[in-house]
Interface confidence: medium
């Protein structure tokens, strides 16, 4: 029985050049975290493997760092990083959980406009 | 080129135990998650055991917790499964696999060998 | 344990013919199913993960969708060295498990 839900940050949005937190967070489950991938769309991001610790994907190795947590901050974002973000954790014995962030990287102007309407 | 060989099988008596070995070649081991797939005679496949990278974690069906073992020497790239207590419903090909988390699958599977419990 | 069914258990068909076989879960599996093949006397092989997406070396006659509770896996020209056991299996939650398999015979 998967009784655990997934907080993340919701939709959020950031601007072109800044860096953002991607954050989930697994609550209302004593399931063991073996690891946490992060994919944007198809893509691997990054894993947080409880035995082998962080790998970030080679190509997103300049943008991507780990943390705070099993979170994941992007750096140096471009307008081509707005989509989806999925926060995947796999856990014993329940199973996967999974997480979704949108993310809209916006020119500076507008993202300081916009800031106050993101939805938490 | 990814190699996974099972050894260990044979037949055993109903009570008795056997302990397979699985010899991992081709990537690296100590970076991967493991798992035992069986298959009885002419049946379908069943998952019998999980263990993660470092052997921290250890996952097993209800069939067979308490009675199965699951463990692995990242130093010699083998995968273990001790098994005890064996029943008749044991008898299976008994496969190694390379479980990738990133992939939700098992990715490699070894040629599979045969434990046939039986007086 | 989340039950994996899968159908038709055999089927016969002709090398070109289009071949369908669909799994179906007892619950929300997300798009945490595999497809393996298995040919008589060898281990499985991984063809499709993540429900949809090819495994490597697999060919493009191959594919597969689906999500949630119904999945399809689809040979769109049935070629001779097809003809073998499918089976369809859930990463979503322990245990993991398998569909009962479907044979793919020659007509």
């Known amino acids: 029985m998967m009784t655990g839900t997934i907080e993340t940050t919701g939709n959020i949005s950031a601007e072109k050049g800044g860096s953002i937190i991607l954050q989930c967070h697994l609550s209302s489950t004593t399931a063991q975290v073996t690891q946490v991938n992060w994919e944007q769309q198809d893509q691997l991001l990054a894993i947080c493997n409880a035995d082998l610790g962080w790998h970030i994907s080679p190509s997103f190795k300049d943008r991507v760092a780990p943390g705070p947590g099993l979170g994941l901050t992007l750096q140096s974002l471009t307008v081509n990083d707005t989509g989806e973000y999925f926060c995947i954790y796999h856990t014993y014995p329940d199973g996967t959980y999974t997480g979704r962030i949108f993310l809209e990287v916006l020119e500076s102007s507008v993202a300081e406009h916009g800031a106050r309407f993101q939805i938490p | 080129e990814v190699q996974l060989v099972e050894s260990g099988g044979g037949l055993v008596q109903p009570g008795g135990s056997l302990r397979l070995s699985c010899a991992a070649s081709?990537?690296?081991?100590?970076?991967?998650?493991m798992s035992w797939v069986r298959q009885a005679p002419g049946k379908g496949l069943e998952w019998v055991a999980t263990?993660?990278?470092?052997?921290?974690?250890?996952y097993y069906p209800d069939s067979v917790k308490g009675r199965f073992t699951i463990s692995r020497d990242n130093a010699k790239n083998t995968l273990y499964l001790q098994m005890n207590s064996l029943r008749a419903e044991d008898t299976a090909v008994y496969y190694c696999t390379r479980w990738l988390l990133s992939l939700y699958a098992m990715d490699y599977w070894g040629q599979g060998t045969l434990v046939t419990v039986s007086s | 344990a989340i039950q994996m069914t899968q159908s038709p258990s055999s089927l016969s068909a002709s090398v070109g013919d289009r071949v369908t076989i669909t799994c179906q879960a007892s619950?929300?599996?997300?798009?945490?199913l595999s497809w393996y093949q298995q040919k008589p006397g060898k281990a499985p092989k991984l063809l499709i993960y993540?429900?949809?997406t090819l495994a490597s070396g697999v060919p493009s006659r191959f594919s597969g969708s689906g999500s949630g509770t119904d999945f399809t896996l689809t040979i769109s020209s049935l070629q001779p060295d097809d003809f073998a056991t499918y089976y369809c299996q859930q990463g979503q939650t322990y245990p993991f498990t398998f569909g009962g398999g479907t044979k793919v015979e020659i007509k």
């Open positions: 993540k429900a949809s």
């Open positions: 081709g990537f690296t081991f100590s970076s991967y998650t």
């Open positions: 263990i993660s990278s470092g052997g921290s974690y250890t």
């Open positions: 619950q929300n599996i997300n798009v945490w």
